[in-house]
Interface confidence: low
């Protein structure tokens, strides 16, 4: 029988009048144009939703925008629209909500044509009141604000200024002309590229990259021939013209670009590129595209200092620049990602890893799947994900997978199981042990949300008809109910619910439509009455992640230690509640090969734990690039995983040796580097 | 095992509209496509239209636009194809066929082909006044 | 729409032969392309898929080749069942086109 048809499925007591009792619609007055929400702040209910509607004129466009205020997570909205003077706001620059909890809101409206710059509304109460701001420059982008202080904004200006703010968007100073991109480092460091002759584009290759670190009184450049540059983790990164040709390579620096080394990474010509698809403070995914238009590149992995790189992934799927990657980390459990390989035969095929990119295996067929047409073994096949590349090829799959920190070991996505990715009706599958195994949790496409850190699951059928009926978990997606949460159904268009996962409220936003008009309606459900007690202890129990061997005593050991988490059981129907925190307790592993990515020069064979050296570099010296001088390596073949915690057991030798050579590949060495103050 | 099975023979008249049937077994009905493909006597292959069983979309053949409606009944794992103000020409053998079409990367919309691999045993429209 | 091209018409075989039956299409279908066979009185059977996998419970003296533009379906070993009639079709970019035919007779 279909998931959540079983006999066993045991009914929540009562849930249609305890739903009926918190399910809360506002119908917006106004007519059906575009609307966008943003959560204001942590755990505050605040939501702000802009609706607007555009009247093409003959000659202009005419639009016009209003702006809601809930602070009760959605159930009463406020027509706030008088507090920014009716004005109207440029969706394509959003809200531009403030970090953490600072409570901070920036609202661009549009101008005339005629007028000497932008217009802004700032907020530093949650949306409760707005000041307007006329600016000095028009803006290109949204206001980006610095992560450390939300006082501190940047922004580029329609003639390639780059604006800085100090008092949260009171007072502006243009700081540098001639600005392509600007980003905020740490510590409100400004790192912006720089074109010297015609503009952003004419440079391309030959830009300068600046750095500020007191909000522009003083400037270092820190690179020339400069192609772009990224920011991950802590590592920035560059991506450098070479000097005799149109090739460029990536250099990297831990230092804020004080010192740089160059990546050990295959350069790439004008049509290829390169795409940070994961980073954090150990080390970097890195793609890179192949030459010609495959649609395909290789992941390589960083050591922890981001150059050296070890192949990864072979022909993973990435379109081109900008185009799409299914590329996922799976945040409820630590090391796992899932991706997408173009195969020889042109079908594309999901990939997984558990220990953070060091080996890729395909999913494990659901148990209670049979494999489609595209098995060439009836019984042989694998789950395949569908993610952005599905999406962006109009397949009927309204969502990404989706996973949460707090949701232990739940990863839900849209997939079909065979030997590649089907463009039939895709089903929603669940794992509950971030990815080893899996489950399919609902026929057909359907919208979905984590609510409660686990502890429900909601979903909504994607439909072109209008609907009235969501579907709810408290299980995991086991069991599902149904409840109609509206007479008059209504054509959905989205779930909105907190970012974190930690509310019981969920959001379904739609328009109804008539004769005459349509107009945006929401309907706010609160499922605290579903989840009446809070869990008590009794209701967890012990889980140990990456767990595939229970008698091997190195079961659950990935990237060196192993953990146990406490987790909700499946059969209790209660609150983990705000203020949950996921218990884990870790554990440090003996090193074992496992332990190791395969160091420059060395690749692991498919099935196999041993590094083996590249038949064409066999006999060569192992040469790389750090810090601007050449190094010999001398290795056996592998160096420790970034992050990896690991302590004994194996410790193959590897060594480096200063060949005292200079290798900046034109890049500006440290004492090359000038500085200016303003 | 899997099955296509479609309705019996018809006999119409210029101007008038005929529906085909095409019940599905052996299989899940909604996890494959289901194209509609005709043969006039002594003649070649001609690809109508295809249907997804999911939401019922279908995307027809510009020569067909029109006049021709495909739809199915998840119920009884049916589809239908209904061809409407009928000519001599459209004399012919219809058949369903399952189609699972599969998708690949490189390129626009690009996809790997599985071919139709399943088709029911065609019904004759004759149309003649 | 992708118009595909068969050649040749007719083929006269004897059995235990060779043949060689080829399809062009007029724009690149990558390897988007199925072989069929068909009889008198019978539905079409799919033969090829992917330009040259052969599907279930097809003999392995069929195979196809080709990829882009120029196909070719080989039946290395023509026995009495394999006179035909054969279509490829694309499916590369909607309408999905048949070519127009081979027909493989006794010589």
């Known amino acids: 029988s279909a998931p959540g048809e079983d006999e066993e499925c045991g009914r929540v007591r009562d849930f249609v009048a305890k739903l009926a009792n918190n399910t809360h619609q506002h119908v917006f007055d106004d007519l059906r144009g575009s609307v966008s929400l943003s959560w204001v702040g942590d755990s505050t209910g605040v939501i702000l939703v802009l609706t607007t509607f555009h009247v093409p004129l003959v000659i202009m466009t005419f639009g016009q925008s209003k702006l809601y205020r809930s602070e009760d997570y959605g159930k009463n909205f406020k027509d706030i629209t008088d507090l920014i003077n009716n004005t109207f706001i440029r969706t394509e620059f959003g809200m531009a909500i403030g970090p953490e909890n600072s409570g901070k809101v920036v609202l661009t409206a549009e101008v005339s044509g005629g007028s000497r710059g932008g217009r802004i509304f700032r907020s530093s109460d949650f949306a409760k009141n707005f000041v307007q701001t006329d600016l000095p420059f028009h803006p290109l982008t949204q206001m980006m604000y610095s992560p450390q202080n939300s006082d501190y904004l940047l922004a580029l200006s329609t003639e390639n200024g780059l604006w800085v703010s100090k008092n949260f968007g009171g007072k502006w100073e243009e700081i540098h002309k001639a600005v392509c991109l600007a980003k905020w480092g740490s510590d409100n460091t400004i790192f912006f590229t720089t074109y010297a002759n015609g503009s952003c584009k004419a440079d391309l290759g030959a830009l300068e990259l600046w750095r500020t670190s007191d909000l522009g009184k003083s400037f270092k450049t820190i690179g020339v021939k400069i192609y772009s540059f990224g920011l991950g983790g802590r590592f920035l990164f560059a991506s450098v013209m070479a000097d005799k040709d149109t090739t460029r390579r990536i250099h990297v620096s831990t230092d804020q670009g004080d010192t740089w080394s160059m990546a050990q990474l295959p350069s790439v010509g004008q049509e290829q590129f390169y795409s940070i698809l994961a980073a954090n403070d150990d080390m970097v995914f890195m793609h890179v595209d192949e030459p010609g238009d495959t649609g395909f590149g290789t992941i390589f992995t960083s050591d922890d200092r981001g150059i050296v790189y070890s192949k990864s992934l072979d022909r993973h799927l990435y379109t081109t620049t900008g185009g799409e990657t299914d590329f996922t980390n799976v945040t409820s459990l630590r090391g796992v990602y899932i991706t997408s390989v173009l195969s020889e035969d042109n079908s594309i095929q999901t990939m997984i890893t558990f220990d953070q990119g060091g080996r890729w295996t395909h999913l494990r067929k659901p148990e209670n799947s049979e494999c489609d047409a595209t098995a060439k073994n009836k019984n042989e096949c694998s789950l395949h994900i569908h993610a952005s590349y599905s999406i962006s090829q109009k397949l009927n799959v309204p969502m990404a997978p989706l996973s949460e920190p707090n949701a232990v070991g739940i990863v839900i996505a849209h997939g079909s199981v065979g030997d590649a990715i089907s463009v039939m009706v895709p089903d929603v599958y669940i794992s509950d042990d971030g990815g080893y195994s899996w489950t399919k949790m609902l026929e057909g496409p359907h919208y979905y949300t984590i609510l409660d850190s686990g502890g429900i699951i909601v979903a909504i059928e994607h439909s072109s008809r209008p609907i009235n009926v969501i579907k709810f978990s408290t299980d995991e997606g086991q069991c599902w109910q149904t409840y109609t949460f509206t007479r008059d159904p209504i054509y959905f268009t989205g779930l909105a619910s907190e970012p974190g996962a930690r509310s019981m409220n969920i959001s379904i936003w739609g328009f109804t439509e008539s004769f005459l008009t349509s107009q945006w309606v929401s309907y706010t459900i609160d499922f605290k009455d579903i989840l009446e007690r809070n869990c008590e202890e009794k209701d967890y129990t012990i889980w140990l992640a990456h767990s595939t061997d229970p008698e091997d005593y190195e079961d659950g050991c990935i990237l060196g230690y192993k953990e146990q988490f406490l987790r909700l059981r499946k059969s209790s129907v209660c609150q983990n509640g705000r203020d949950y925190v996921v218990t884990k307790q870790p554990s440090i592993c003996l090193c074992s090969l496992e332990d190791f990515l395969c160091d420059f020069g060395y690749y692991r064979p498919e099935n196999d734990s041993k590094c083996v050296e590249q038949p064409e570099l066999k006999g060569h010296d192992l040469e790389f690039c750090l810090y601007g001088r050449e190094e010999h390596l001398t290795t056996n073949g592998y160096r420790k995983i970034p992050g990896d915690k690991c302590q004994g057991g194996v410790n193959p030798v590897r060594e480096v040796k200063d060949l005292k050579k200079k290798c900046t590949s034109n890049f500006l060495s440290p004492e090359k580097q000038n500085s200016k103050s303003n | 095992q899997v099955q296509l099975v479609q309705s019996g023979a018809e006999v119409k008249k210029p101007g008038a509209s005929v529906k085909v049937s095409c019940k599905a077994s052996?299989?899940?009905?909604?996890?494959?496509?289901m194209s509609w493909v005709r043969q006039a006597p002594g003649q070649g292959l001609e690809w109508m239209g295809i249907i997804n069983p999911v939401g019922g979309s279908a995307s027809y053949a510009r020569k067909f636009q029109g006049r021709v409606t495909m739809t199915r009944d998840t119920s009884t794992s049916t589809v239908y194809m209904e061809l409407s103000s009928l000519r001599s020409e459209d004399t012919a053998v219809y058949y369903c066929?399952?189609?699972?079409?599969?998708?690949?990367?490189?390129?626009?919309?690009?996809?790997?082909?599985?071919?139709?691999?399943?088709w029911g045993q065609g019904t004759t429209v004759t149309v003649s006044s | 729409e992708i118009v595909m091209t068969q050649s040749p018409a007719t083929l006269s075989v004897s059995p235990g032969e060779r043949a060689t039956l080829s399809c062009r299409a007029s724009?690149?279908?990558?390897?988007?392309l199925a072989w069929y066979q068909q009889k008198p009185g019978q539905a079409p059977r799919l033969l090829i898929y992917g330009a040259s996998t052969r599907a279930t419970g097809i003999p392995a003296r069929f195979s196809g080749s080709g990829s882009g533009t120029e196909f070719t379906l080989t039946i290395s070993s023509l026995q009495s069942e394999d006179f035909a009639v054969y279509y490829c079709?694309?499916?590369?970019?909607?309408?999905?086109?048949f070519g127009g035919g081979t027909k493989v007779e006794i010589k």
């Open positions: 724009q690149s279908v990558s390897s988007n």
């Open positions: 079709q694309q499916a590369r970019l909607g309408p999905w086109t």
């Open positions: 052996g299989y899940t009905f909604t996890s494959r496509y």
């Open positions: 066929a399952r189609d699972p079409s599969g998708i690949a990367a490189a390129g626009p919309a690009s996809r790997y082909y599985y071919g139709m691999d399943v």
